[in-house]
């Protein structure tokens, strides 16, 4: 699997989950939420060669017509497979809400 | 929905469902296919700006923090949503055998 | 290399106010929380605040009255922490911390500040 | 305001040993949770961050576990530099409150 405990550990140019620290305040312009400050979204990136952890046949079918037709603006991109929710604290007025953001972690990645 | 009706009728720079033509010889070098000699597997390619049919909240995210840091090299992908299957007609020895390949087609896209 | 520099001890009267500063570098510095802490002699840690010095936006543990004012320049990436009205219970080490991913990575060495009559 | 209880309040220990200390939280929070190592007449040094992360730098034999209330922070093989005061901290709301410390 394309996750951390394989990328993190290996320099790979393919596609691969990458380290991605998110601020709210700085990155996203979010004052809202109070908690956490930021969090690891992390984000997938790199090459999706044949066969390279393909998603599904027409990402088998595309990287294979890359391959042989190289100069085609066609290929498959690496994105997120596998996300997790993150909790978050904010106010509305004085009252603290809690509440649980889906999707908002990537575990890991696919060519697709 | 970024599928043929909306993107084939627009001059569309963001992520749009684009048309591809594969040739099973030509394109893929496989001979074992005898009907059909091609297909129309489309492929999903664009930009993918903040809120543009962004998949998930992990998505949106990726794509605010790319507007707020657009020199960092995270951002969301343009890849295929909806697919369908194409059925084929292939030879064993002399016997016809007809199979559906499943996720061939790509019939809409979205930023993930 | 981040580093967070604290000015040095001070001694003060009961009832005075006292001004501790934290240079920073190394990063930027508007983009980062910055809290503050006291740790009295032989005794344990107690958060007193945090600024943001992008837009100067403050948290402060009530714990310290409205005695406790944050600050920050940011054309010297310099965060301030004042703190009025003396008692001889605010003798504590005061420490600058940068707030990075659910924790306080880099600490300022320390500023010790003694109230005496 | 969160509660942060830690356990034992000290240890005397013997090279090699392994030893894990405890911190309760009055409430959830999550796994917003960071552990310090403070040395005589030094400032405390960050070890584990979001309850499990090692910070850089820090070495292989501390480890961090825990979620919601109930955490620990495990030395598999003490070294005599290790001898210090270890605080957890929570960063779910403010104030962020340090546990009183386990020496």
């Known amino acids: 699997a394309l996750d951390a405990a394989y990328c993190f550990r290996n320099v790979q140019d393919n596609c691969c989950l990458r380290p991605l620290y998110i601020d709210f305040k700085r990155d996203l312009g979010w004052k809202w939420i109070h908690e956490p400050k930021g969090y690891n979204a992390n984000f997938c990136a790199g090459a999706c060669p044949y066969l390279w952890s393909s998603d599904t046949q027409h990402s088998r079918v595309l990287s294979l017509y890359n391959t042989i037709n190289p100069e085609a603006s066609a290929s498959p991109c690496c994105v997120s497979q596998d996300l997790e929710p993150l909790t978050i604290l904010y106010y509305i007025g004085k009252t603290p809400k809690i509440e649980q953001l889906s999707n908002m972690i990537v575990k890991s990645c696919k060519c697709s | 929905a970024l599928d043929a009706a909306y993107c084939f009728r627009n001059v569309q720079d963001n992520c749009c469902l684009r048309p591809l033509y594969i040739d099973f010889k030509r394109d893929l070098g496989w001979k074992w296919i005898h009907e059909p000699k091609g297909y129309n597997a489309n492929f999903c390619a664009g930009a993918c700006p903040y809120l543009w049919s962004s998949d998930t909240q992990h998505s949106r995210v990726l794509s605010l923090y790319n507007t707020i840091n657009p020199e960092a090299s995270a951002s969301p992908c343009c890849v295929s949503q909806d697919l369908e299957p194409l059925t084929i007609l292939y030879y064993i020895g002399k016997t016809p055998k007809i199979e559906q390949l499943s996720n061939m087609i790509v019939k809409s896209c979205k930023c993930s | 290399e981040v580093q967070l520099v604290q000015s040095a001890a001070e001694v003060k009267k009961p009832g005075a106010s006292v001004k501790v500063s934290c240079k920073t570098s190394?990063?930027?510095?508007?983009?980062?929380?910055m809290n503050w802490v006291q740790q009295a002699p032989g005794a344990g840690l107690d958060w007193m605040g945090q600024?943001?010095?992008?837009?100067?936006?403050?948290n402060y543990n009530g714990k310290f009255k409205g005695r406790v004012t944050l600050t920050a320049d940011t054309s010297t990436s310099t965060a301030y922490m004042e703190l009025s009205s003396l008692r001889a219970e605010d003798t504590a080490v005061y420490y600058c911390?940068?707030?990075?991913?659910?924790?306080?990575?880099?600490w300022g060495q320390g500023t010790l500040v003694t109230v005496s009559s | 305001e969160i509660v942060m209880t830690q356990s034992p309040a000290s240890l005397s220990l013997s090279q090699g040993e392994k030893v894990t200390i405890t911190c309760r939280a009055s409430?959830?929070?999550?796994?917003?949770l960071a552990w310090y190592q403070q040395r005589p007449g030094q400032a405390p040094k960050l070890l584990i961050y979001?309850?499990?992360n090692l910070a850089d730098g820090v070495p292989s034999r501390f480890s961090g576990s825990g979620s919601g209330t109930d955490f620990s922070l495990t030395i598999s093989s003490l070294e005599p530099e290790d001898v210090a005061v270890y605080y957890c901290?929570?960063?779910?709301?403010?104030?962020?409150?340090f546990g009183q410390g386990t020496k």
């Open positions: 409430e959830n929070i999550y796994s917003n």
């Open positions: 901290q929570h960063f779910w709301g403010t104030p962020y409150t």
């Open positions: 600024i943001y010095p992008g837009d100067g936006d403050t």
């Open positions: 190394g990063y930027t510095f508007t983009s980062s929380w």
């Open positions: 911390a940068r707030h990075y991913d659910g924790s306080t990575d880099y």
């Open positions: 979001a309850a499990t």
